[in-house]
Interface confidence: medium
């Protein structure tokens, strides 16, 4: 059918509460295209009854709610006019009550539902919430083993819960709890959170800054020879790496035959209170496929891409 | 000991923008976030947003879209900008910090600078 | 947004009394409140913060009770510089609210 397929990340979902996904693949969905969700390659679209259990509301899958048998390869069609992707979404649904005392045997947990506090820092912990625009979210409220957090050290800001002065008794498990409302209808949305204590701060008690790129396009003629840095801040004392992947894989291991895309050598210039690191990669020759296609920047938790595209003048006729 | 001291233009004419500039002493910005309140002629006080210690900003929903904050922490200086000023956005306006312990929000106040919006 | 109300707009006084200024937010904020004093002409001063523990300082006579919605400043033995605004503040939840505020009078 002429449709290029894109795979991308597994969902592990959690049963008997909303979930949407938003198919979105920036190189594609910032033109003029057409989105159309699919569940295991039926030919079949997914309902866009607003009414349906699983409908597709624009861009996103809706699932209201999840249900144990939703497990299941999805796709979502986004033609344009001259190009057609077919992405690849694995949800899996499990069982969970985030207050059982068995909080083990999730498998790989994305990294939504386990995160970070620095120790003696101000942090803060993230609600995520991802629905499309026809669902509107009630305030959100956070419980610690199952009970309401209320304590001093904590203020609720939109989707996050600000901890003051972090103390290692701050791990464990958290939820975040929502209710979400569609058509008049309401629904509780429970993320379970695991929470675990570094002593590590980050550049100014947070994760490292990309400063350059910043999730762009960037026009370069077939053919010719390319070299983008990474620059990133980041605290004196870290202990983070910083690369370049595509597909999720490291680009000297993703090239590692033909080499012609490498990272370079890492440099870094010392400031007071942080450094500044560089990090390049280098495309010999550009190629057909290298557009559309996200380089990462990966430093620590935090990612910026880049995407290839061929110069203006080549789209004319369009 | 922990200072805030705001700079301010006094008058300002409607839609035109306010800039107020809060220099810290006594602290570094890079361990601090600094809140931005202001205070009416009727006394009331009003949160309108901050800046966390790694330069990401959060704002009270009205001001969202004429309200920005930037800092130069080497400089121990942070910037206040409000676009659209109408009358009654007429207050004090001050940059404050928590205490160095839970809970003890706004512990320093700055000394507030006088914004009157005018014709 | 919770709302921090307080419902003495005025509170008229006398030296040595026992005074108490209530302030009422429209959500459990637990013991998220805290106290402010404010002189003609300066910056608000903390006084309370966790509803009831006392800023460094800040003298006895001033004590902060309560939980959940109901919060009460209590001023045990007031003295001329007492006379002040006082308001409260939540910090549960953003954004970030004060209440109207209480004026303390002499009779």
């Known amino acids: 059918d002429g449709c290029k397929d894109i795979f991308m990340k597994n969902e592990i979902l959690s049963a008997s509460q909303p979930f949407a996904f938003n198919c979105t693949f920036p190189p594609i969905t910032s033109g003029e295209v057409s989105v159309t969700w699919y569940k295991n390659s039926s030919k079949i679209p997914v309902s866009k009854i607003i009414q349906s259990r699983i409908h597709q509301d624009e861009t996103w899958i809706l699932f209201l709610p999840m249900e144990w048998g939703d497990s299941g390869v999805y796709q979502c069609v986004i033609k344009g006019r001259d190009s057609c992707h077919r992405i690849h979404v694995n949800l899996t649904v499990f069982e969970k009550h985030w207050c059982d005392t068995s909080i083990g045997g999730l498998p790989n947990l994305s990294d939504e539902y386990k995160q970070i506090l620095h120790l003696g820092k101000d942090d803060s912990l993230t609600c995520h919430l991802h629905f499309p625009k026809s669902c509107v979210l009630g305030p959100i409220k956070w419980y610690k083993d199952c009970n309401e957090i209320k304590g001093e050290r904590f203020t609720v800001l939109e989707t996050r819960l600000l901890v003051s002065n972090v103390s290692a008794e701050d791990r464990g498990n958290y939820a975040c709890q929502a209710i979400l409302t569609h058509s008049g209808k309401q629904y509780e949305v429970l993320n379970g959170i695991t929470v675990s204590i570094t002593e590590r701060a980050g550049y100014g008690g947070s994760v490292p800054k990309i400063i350059y790129p910043k999730n762009h396009s960037i026009e370069v003629q077939l053919g010719t020879t390319l070299i983008v840095d990474c620059n990133v801040t980041d605290t004196k004392d870290n202990t983070n790496l910083r690369c370049w992947r595509v597909n999720n894989t490291l680009v000297d291991d993703y090239y590692d035959e033909s080499k012609r895309i490498r990272e370079g050598v890492e440099t870094h210039v010392s400031f007071r209170e942080h450094n500044l690191y560089t990090v390049n990669i280098t495309f010999l020759e550009v190629k057909m496929e290298d557009y559309g296609l996200p380089f990462m920047c990966h430093a620590g938790v935090s990612t910026a891409y880049i995407i290839l595209q061929l110069p203006a003048p080549d789209f004319r006729a369009y | 000991q922990v200072q805030l001291k705001e700079s301010g233009p006094g008058l300002v004419a409607p839609s035109q923008s306010l800039s107020i500039t809060c220099t810290v002493s006594?602290?570094?910005?890079?361990?601090?976030?600094v809140h931005w309140v202001r205070q009416f002629p009727g006394k009331g006080l009003e949160w309108l947003g901050v800046?966390?210690?790694?330069?990401?900003?959060d704002f009270n929903a009205p001001f969202k879209s004429r309200l920005s904050i930037n800092k130069d922490n080497s400089k121990s200086q942070v910037f206040f900008k409000m676009n659209s000023l109408q009358i009654d956005d007429t207050a004090i306006y001050y940059c404050?910090?928590?205490?160095?312990?839970?809970?003890?929000?706004?512990?320093?106040w700055g000394q507030g600078t006088l914004v009157t919006v005018s014709a | 947004d919770i709302v921090m109300t307080q419902s003495q707009k005025f509170l008229s006084t006398s030296v040595g009394v026992r005074v108490s200024v209530t302030c009422k937010a429209s959500?459990?904020?637990?013991?998220?409140v805290l106290w402010y004093q404010q002189k003609i002409g300066q910056s608000p001063k903390p006084l309370i913060y966790?509803?009831?523990y006392r800023h460094s300082g800040v003298p006895d006579r001033f004590t902060g009770s309560g939980s959940g919605t109901d919060f009460t400043l209590i001023i045990s033995n007031v003295q001329s510089e007492d006379l002040a605004e006082y308001f409260c503040?939540?910090?549960?939840?953003?954004?970030?609210?004060f209440g109207p505020g209480t004026k303390l009078e002499l009779k």
């Open positions: 966790s509803a009831s």
């Open positions: 959500q459990d904020v637990g013991t998220n």
């Open positions: 006594g602290f570094s910005l890079t361990n601090y976030a």
């Open positions: 404050a910090r928590k205490g160095g312990y839970s809970g003890s929000w706004f512990a320093y």
């Open positions: 503040q939540q910090y549960s939840r953003y954004p970030l609210t």
């Open positions: 800046i966390w210690s790694d330069g990401s900003t």
